[in-house]
């Protein structure tokens, strides 16, 4: 019969014959022959291959370096890589999460719109009219100005995006 020019899924063409790829978690040792199927062996400790493959070496699991603020979020298997994340208060600098930086704080006049996670930084927003933030914080949202009216008080000093209103007693002399 004619030698194949293309092979089925999970096969590869070598020496004019179709050989099975190695399954995830295994590496290629020898191509198939006329006598035997493809020879594959399991990846070792701290190694993985995550696809059907013809790789002769497994990949090393990612190392979550604590010196870079990293920790293991999910331990790798023979078929999956280790997933790193950052220590509390830090977030990844890239999608690959190879190092971490401290979460940014929102300055006075800005509040936290979205709290940072291990993989995303703090998102800040300017405090709109009627709201303020007087601290630099990675957690605090903009707070609404105090409602002097509900306390039977009046505004003595107007609020800003950085300060609350100052309430004072009603002027009793006023009719």
């Amino acid at each position: 019969p004619e030698p194949p020019t293309a092979c089925r899924e999970k096969q590869y063409l070598i020496n004019s014959q179709c050989c099975s790829l190695c399954q995830p978690g295994q590496k290629l040792v020898s191509d198939c022959t006329e006598f035997t199927e493809t020879e594959c062996l399991p990846c070792g400790e701290s190694e993985f291959l995550d696809t059907w493959n013809r790789e002769t070496h497994c990949h090393q699991h990612k190392y979550c370096d604590p010196n870079l603020g990293l920790r293991v979020q999910q331990k790798g298997t023979s078929e999956t890589d280790t997933i790193c994340t950052c220590e509390e208060g830090w977030h990844c600098t890239s999608e690959a999460c190879e190092s971490c930086v401290l979460h940014r704080s929102c300055s006075p006049g800005f509040g936290v719109k979205q709290i940072a996670t291990g993989v995303s930084d703090t998102i800040c927003e300017p405090c709109p009219v009627g709201f303020f933030s007087n601290v630099s914080s990675a957690f605090e949202k903009c707070h609404p100005w105090t409602s002097c009216e509900t306390k039977d008080l009046v505004v003595q000093q107007a609020g800003t995006n950085k300060t609350d209103v100052v309430c004072g007693p009603q002027d009793r002399l006023r009719a």
Epitope: I14, N15, L28, V29, S30, D31, T33, F35, T36, E37, E39, L41, P42, G44, E45, T56, H57
Partner: antibody, heavy 116, light 110 residues
Framework: QLQLQESGPGLVKPSEILSLTCTVS??????????WGWIRQPPGKGLEWIGN???????YYSPSLKSRVTISVDTSKNQFSLKLNSVTAADTAVYYC????????WGQGTLVTVSS | QSALTQPPSASGSPGQSVTISCTGT?????????VSWYQQHPGKAPKLMIY???KRPSGVPDRFSGSKSGNTASLTVSGLQAEDEADYYC??????????FGGGTKLTVL
């Protein structure tokens, strides 16, 4: 058809180095199979795995022989080699080279005697 | 790593079946489906008869079959023939690119 052939001295003195070479013919040492192995068999005894080598040079040795064994590869000559240091009479054996870790192809074996 | 345990000898009459066992641990035989069996006639190199527990290279008679249960692998030769008289060795992958052989079994055809 793939063929493997061991070669080297048949007699080695105690404390010296045993050196053998395996020549692969009928195929390339860096394609079809990517790992190659050495096995030995003392007279009248069973098979013992010595180690394997990846065609780019990574080596894997039997824990019991690791301190004395070196396997190397020469892709330009289509050969891989075994060196065993500080030999004693207990290293007298037929030494085989073979393909992969499955060992579906073997050399015919060569007897190495350790004696003074 | 220790050698896998095989019975030193086994025998059977022509036409009968014989089973040879190969016992290891959960770190080798029990941990991987990478058991091979080799036949060796006197003065000859070993020949691969079974690989990955139960697969036969083409050209090996289907009288030879392999299986595994727990930490023990088995080679069964059915319909024994005179030319089956030989030494049989098992081997297993033992993790981290290590291999281990059994001590061998001498099969006699009575």
């Amino acid at each position: 058809q793939l063929q493997l052939q061991e070669s080297g001295p048949g007699l080695v003195k105690p404390s010296e180095i045993l050196s053998l070479t395996c020549t692969v013919s009928g195929g390339s040492i860096s394609s079809s199979s990517y790992y190659w192995g050495w096995i030995r068999q003392p007279p009248g005894k069973g098979l013992e795995w010595i180690g394997n080598i990846y065609y780019r040079g990574d080596t894997y040795y039997s824990p019991s022989l690791k301190s004395r064994v070196t396997i190397s590869v020469d892709t330009s000559k289509n050969q891989f080699s075994l060196k065993l240091n500080s030999v004693t009479a207990a290293d007298t054996a037929v030494y085989y080279c073979a393909k992969g870790f499955r060992f579906d192809y073997w050399g015919q074996g060569t007897l190495v005697t350790v004696s003074s | 790593q220790s050698a896998l345990t095989q019975p030193p000898s086994a025998s059977g009459s022509p036409g009968q079946s014989v089973t040879i066992s190969c016992t290891g641990t959960s770190s080798d035989v029990g941990g991987y489906n990478y058991v091979s069996w080799y036949q060796q006639h006197p003065g000859k190199a070993p020949k691969l008869m079974i690989y990955e527990v139960s697969k036969r290279p083409s050209g090996v008679p289907d009288r030879f079959s392999g299986s595994k249960s727990g930490n023990t692998a088995s080679l069964t030769v059915s319909g024994l023939q005179a030319e089956d008289e030989a030494d049989y060795y098992c081997s297993s992958y033992a993790g981290s690119n290590n291999l281990v052989f059994g001590g061998g079994t001498k099969l006699t055809v009575l």
